[in-house]
Interface confidence: medium
């Protein structure tokens, strides 16, 4: 079982996935960074039938679709989340 | 109750490599973040390295990374950290470590295991 | 990395007394600080974290206070059984770091 805890404690993710998520069912990303109370890097997928999925960021899949993210926005105006 | 048996110390020569187990029980040790830390003889608390429940994500000290891995296998509810390449400096007592959830904070210890790193 | 300095690293008190030690980190780290109490031979144990929330188990005589970088552990009547060493920890960032260690002696 994948959980994310939503406390006064700021790290979220207890358990990560590397199962790669199919683009298509990604709603959205959001990356949080180390630091403001969580030392570890943390990337958290909500998908479009409302689950939330902490992911691995060692992950080749979510790596390749981070890179293009950050391609994106280079040349487009920054978003606040992904 | 939380408890956690650290295995697998004793005396090795430098250059030498030793593996770390830390036994875990009482607790769903696939949910838990774990930690290694240690404390050399008369010194102080040195944090060493951190795993996530999946074991995906991993963080070392500058001053181990490189030379040891930590590692988990969820289905023996076991931790490891395997040490190579030990300099004199490593010698400590390693302390495994259940952080509590959602937070960087060793909240179970382990009795620690000791090792020694002389010729 | 955040450096961790705790004063004094010694202290000497007596039973009843209320005793303060202080620990600075080297830059903000917010409120993101725990405590441990060690006493020889025996593995540290978790006294605070969050700056000021008491762990499971721990009598309320400890509290903790501060937040940015400069943090207090108070024993507000000092028991024989609270002599020990006493370590701050921060966990803002990795690689986490602890203080020196604050040894509590009876006088």
């Known amino acids: 079982v994948l959980e994310v805890y939503y406390t006064h404690l700021r790290c979220r993710c207890v358990q990560e996935s590397s199962v790669f998520i199919p683009r298509r069912f990604i709603d959205r990303i959001q990356i949080s960074p180390r630091g403001n109370g969580c030392p570890r890097k943390e990337i958290i997928v909500w998908k479009k039938n409302k689950s939330v999925v902490c992911v691995d960021p060692q992950a080749e899949w979510i790596q390749r679709i981070m890179e293009m993210l950050r391609k994106k926005s280079s040349s487009t105006p920054p978003v606040p989340v992904f | 109750e939380v408890q956690l048996l650290e295995s697998g110390g004793g005396l090795v020569q430098p250059g030498g490599s030793l593996r770390l187990s830390c036994a875990a029980s009482?607790?769903?040790?696939?949910?838990?973040?774990m930690s290694w830390v240690r404390q050399a003889p008369g010194k102080g608390l040195e944090w060493v390295s951190a795993i996530s429940g999946s074991g995906g994500s991993t963080y070392y000290a500058d001053s181990v990374k490189g030379r040891f891995t930590i590692s988990r296998d969820n289905s023996k509810n076991t931790l490891y950290l395997q040490m190579n390449s030990l300099r004199a400096e490593d010698t400590a007592v390693y302390y495994c470590?259940?952080?509590?959830?959602?937070?960087?904070?060793?909240?179970?210890w382990g009795q620690g295991t000791l090792v020694t790193v002389s010729s | 990395d955040t450096q961790m300095t705790q004063s004094p690293s010694t202290l000497s008190a007596s039973v009843g007394d209320r005793v303060t030690i202080t620990c600075r980190a080297s830059?903000?780290?917010?409120?993101?600080l725990a405590w441990y109490q060690q006493k020889p031979g025996k593995a540290p144990k978790l006294l605070i974290y969050k700056a000021s929330s008491l762990a499971s188990g721990v009598p309320s005589r400890f509290s903790g206070s501060g937040s940015g970088t400069e943090f207090t552990l108070t024993i507000s009547s000092l028991q024989p059984d609270d002599f020990a060493t006493y370590y701050c920890q921060q966990y803002s960032n990795y690689p986490l770091t602890f203080g020196g260690g604050t040894k509590l002696e009876i006088k």
């Open positions: 830059e903000g780290i917010y409120h993101w």
């Open positions: 009482g607790f769903t040790f696939g949910n838990s973040w």
């Open positions: 470590t259940r952080d509590l959830p959602g937070i960087a904070v060793a909240g179970y």
